[in-house]
């Protein structure tokens, strides 16, 4: 029968009596930078080519007994997991093999490096179709290490990484930690977090997505027919660059940002138990396993939209906190969220060519994180229409006045540190819902954009009652691109967006009376694209 | 391109030994094994084996285990089978084909064992 | 006794199509992906035809397919010709070697 893993991640219109999906990857070439490799095992032979790199340091200890099929191991594994004839994701990708691990699964940063290095110069010798390079390892932050995987995805190169294997922040580890690389938790049969003995599977919101690794069968080194189970984000992540080979050999024109999209888009959600994350994780980590589309082609419609979670602030006063999104996407929406609910709102604005969300504490607040609501839009024209703080008792509203633009997001940020505290809610009026409202205090800000096709509507729902949390969400066909609180709510502690639904929170209730002051409203802006629509059926 | 190329004809007498040679070219002989296959004259295919050019590692047949030894010659490319105690039934065709796949195959030595 | 059954032989005429059949057992066919299929002339090396149940080496006909449903592996050739009189052999994995079918003879009328 199939294996756990390779099940998980088939749609079921594939899941035949054994797995066997359209189109292998056989347009892709995947880069292993790992261990040595048993190229010849039956799993994989003629499927990878060992290249001639090899920079590894010494293994550590006097006694080590360099045993070749021990150090061909993890490497050979991932092999089969990416591209392997029966246990593996990718039946048609072929790979190439860099050695940066030596036997005992260590490498260095320099080894590393010069291992992409060699991929951008085979590229440029030879440049061939898609690339994935996988790289299933995870060692301390490192700015250069990000910064040379910044450098190849930027020249198309699709990176694929492994969150780590040390329960903690992945954000902590490179190259993990690098927004270019898509990186890969690990979950389990259960689709719950991966436990490895003390620890277990990275997790935060440097984290895409989880994706199977737990007792995944694998070609093992120990003989040439041989598969064992190994567990780790390094075998998360080798079914990530597998799923990717499939996608980019169905549509080899993908971008990464496209790519990342529709790997999050595609995911299972809502799956995994986030009680297994530290408290302050959960909401920054993304409850989404890795999965094939269910048709190769066909995707282009849909309007693409994920959400990017800046780091965390810190406490001080001014502090700010800024999430971006990738070059080729767009920002449509701005949100903050604050554990204490002590913030100053967010405010879109211009840097370096590009919008991006930026949060502000407040005073005696314990910091926020500003959320980006990331959005992949062809043609897209947007901007930032802000209202300052207004005298009128009515509150702040500003709209899209420009011909043919929509509003896609609503921000408003304030100066006063305790706004809202004894004000009541400000009323949307009812028949305008292409604006923003907000505090008469707080500056509003809309986004505001124009794509072919584009159109926006405003849903929102509205508890009289104080809760903990509201949501909103948007309908099938439709994608959430603005997630907002209606303002005139204190203890809200900010909005983001999950998947195509709209968050709220708001401060524990019992802490809150049940007066109008405890009325909390979640506002979204759901959008679709009507152009990219007519397109995809214009190609099929 | 692709080639395995074998060694030429033996008639051995019944309890000798043959040693076959097979000399890969045209491919990275590491990403691939090389595969042993008899043919008894108006027979079907037995697999008997197979090799790592890699490291030297080997899979043998169970009804053939003790009886054959598969090594390799790094340095020539070359990768060689030796069968021992040979009786009149080892009388075949053997073949050398790439990897486990087999999707390449040396042009066959008839291995002819007289009483 | 050859570990996988095929038919000793079939027969078509030109034109047609034939289907020769290879069980086994899910420990063989059924349980991987790796079923091949070998054209043999009399005096020749086999050829590979079909590898991994249903994929065609480059430079073999498009008139060659490949099949599997649980423990039975097929090969058809659409649109017979005279060259394709030969012996057919299908091969699979087993878990730690390889095992093939005795062979089918064809014949073109």
């Known amino acids: 029968s199939i294996p756990w893993n390779l099940e998980r991640i088939t749609p079921p219109r594939y899941r035949a009596d054994e797995y066997q999906p359209p189109d292998g990857g056989s347009l892709v070439e995947v880069y292993l930078l790992d261990t040595s490799i048993q190229s010849d095992h039956r799993e994989i032979e003629g499927r990878v080519m060992v290249t001639d790199f090899e920079n590894v340091p010494e293994e550590d200890g006097t006694r080590f007994h360099r045993q070749a099929s021990k150090c061909d191991s993890h490497g050979t594994h991932l092999a089969g997991v990416v591209s392997g004839r029966d246990a593996g994701v990718a039946k048609g990708a072929s790979m190439r093999s860099l050695r940066v691990l030596n036997c005992q699964g260590k490498g260095t940063v320099s080894g590393t490096l010069i291992g992409l290095e060699f991929i951008r110069k085979s590229q440029l010798v030879q440049p061939v179709g898609p690339l994935v390079v996988l790289l299933p390892l995870a060692g301390g932050y490192s700015r250069v290490l990000n910064a040379a995987c910044q450098r190849l995805a930027r020249a198309g190169v699709v990176l694929v990484t492994a969150a780590g294997n040390f329960r903690d922040d992945a954000c902590l580890y490179s190259p993990a930690s690098a927004p270019e690389v898509i990186t890969v938790g690990a979950t389990n049969a259960q689709d719950q977090p991966v436990t490895l003995g003390t620890l277990g599977t990275n997790f935060g919101r440097c984290v895409d997505l989880f994706a199977p690794g737990e007792d995944i069968i694998g070609a093992s080194s120990d003989c040439s027919t041989c598969f064992v189970s190994q567990s780790g984000t390094s075998q998360a992540a080798a079914h990530v660059a597998g799923i990717a080979a499939m996608m980019l050999s169905a549509e080899p024109e993908l971008t990464l940002a496209e790519l990342r999209q529709r790997l999050i888009h595609f995911s299972a959600k809502d799956v995994i138990n986030e009680a297994w994350f530290p408290e302050d994780q959960r909401v920054l980590t993304p409850n989404l396993v890795a999965a094939l589309p269910p048709s190769t082609h066909g995707a282009g419609w849909q309007l693409f939209c994920r959400t990017v979670w800046s780091a965390h602030s810190g406490p001080t006063r001014m502090a700010t906190a800024v999430a971006r999104c990738a070059p080729d996407e767009e920002l449509l929406s701005c949100s903050s969220f604050s554990r204490s609910g002590k913030r100053r709102g967010e405010r879109m604005e211009a840097q370096g060519g590009k919008l991006v969300c930026r949060a502000h504490n407040a005073f005696g607040g314990e910091g926020v994180y500003a959320i980006a609501r990331c959005c992949l839009l062809p043609q897209a024209n947007c901007s930032v229409h802000t209202a300052p703080p207004a005298e009128a008792s009515m509150g702040t509203r500003v709209h899209c006045h420009q011909q043919g633009h929509v509003l896609t997001g609503c921000s408003s940020h304030w100066e006063v540190e305790d706004l809202g505290t004894h004000k009541p809610p400000v009323l949307r009026p009812r028949g305008q819902p292409n604006q923003c409202v907000g505090h008469r205090e707080a500056s509003i800000h809309a986004s505001c954009c124009h794509a072919p096709g584009l159109e926006c509507k405003v849903k929102e729902h509205g508890i009289p009652a104080p809760q903990e949390q509201v949501t909103v969400a948007c309908e099938e066909g439709w994608t959430l691109t603005g997630c907002s609180a209606l303002p005139g709510t204190s203890h809200v502690l900010g909005a983001y967006a999950v998947d195509n639904t709209c968050v709220v929170r708001s401060r524990d209730v019992s802490t809150t009376g049940s007066t109008s002051e405890g009325a909390v409203t979640a506002v979204a802006i759901c959008c679709r694209s009507r152009h990219l629509a007519q397109a995809s059926q214009e190609l099929q | 391109q692709v080639q395995l190329v074998q060694s030429g004809a033996e008639v051995k007498k019944s309890g000798a030994s043959v040693k076959v040679s097979c000399k890969a070219s045209?491919?990275?002989?590491?990403?691939?094994?090389i595969s042993w296959v008899r043919q008894a004259p108006g027979q079907g295919l037995e697999w008997m084996g197979w090799i790592s050019v890699y490291n030297g590692n080997t899979n043998y047949a169970q009804k053939v285990q003790g009886r054959v030894t598969m090594t390799t010659d790094t340095s020539t490319s070359t990768v060689y089978m030796e069968v021992r105690s040979l009786r009149s039934d080892d009388t075949a065709v053997y073949y050398c084909?790439?990897?486990?796949?087999?999707?390449?195959w040396g042009q066959g030595t008839t291995v002819t064992v007289s009483s | 006794q050859s570990a996988l059954t095929q038919p000793a032989s079939v027969s078509g005429s030109p034109g047609q199509s034939i289907t020769i059949s290879c069980t086994g057992t899910s420990s063989d066919v059924g349980g991987y992906n790796s079923v091949s299929w070998y054209q043999q002339h009399p005096g020749k090396p086999p050829k590979l035809m079909i590898y991994?149940?249903?994929n065609r080496p480059s430079g073999v006909s498009n008139r060659f397919s490949g099949s599997k449903s649980a423990n039975t592996a097929s090969l058809t050739i659409s649109g017979l010709q005279a060259d394709d009189e030969a012996d057919y052999f299908c091969?699979?994995?087993?878990?730690?070697?390889?095992?093939f079918g005795g062979g089918t003879k064809l014949t073109v009328l």
């Open positions: 091969s699979s994995y087993t878990s730690t070697s390889m095992v």
């Open positions: 045209g491919y990275t002989l590491t990403s691939y094994g």
């Open positions: 991994e149940v249903s």
């Open positions: 084909a790439r990897g486990y796949g087999m999707d390449v």
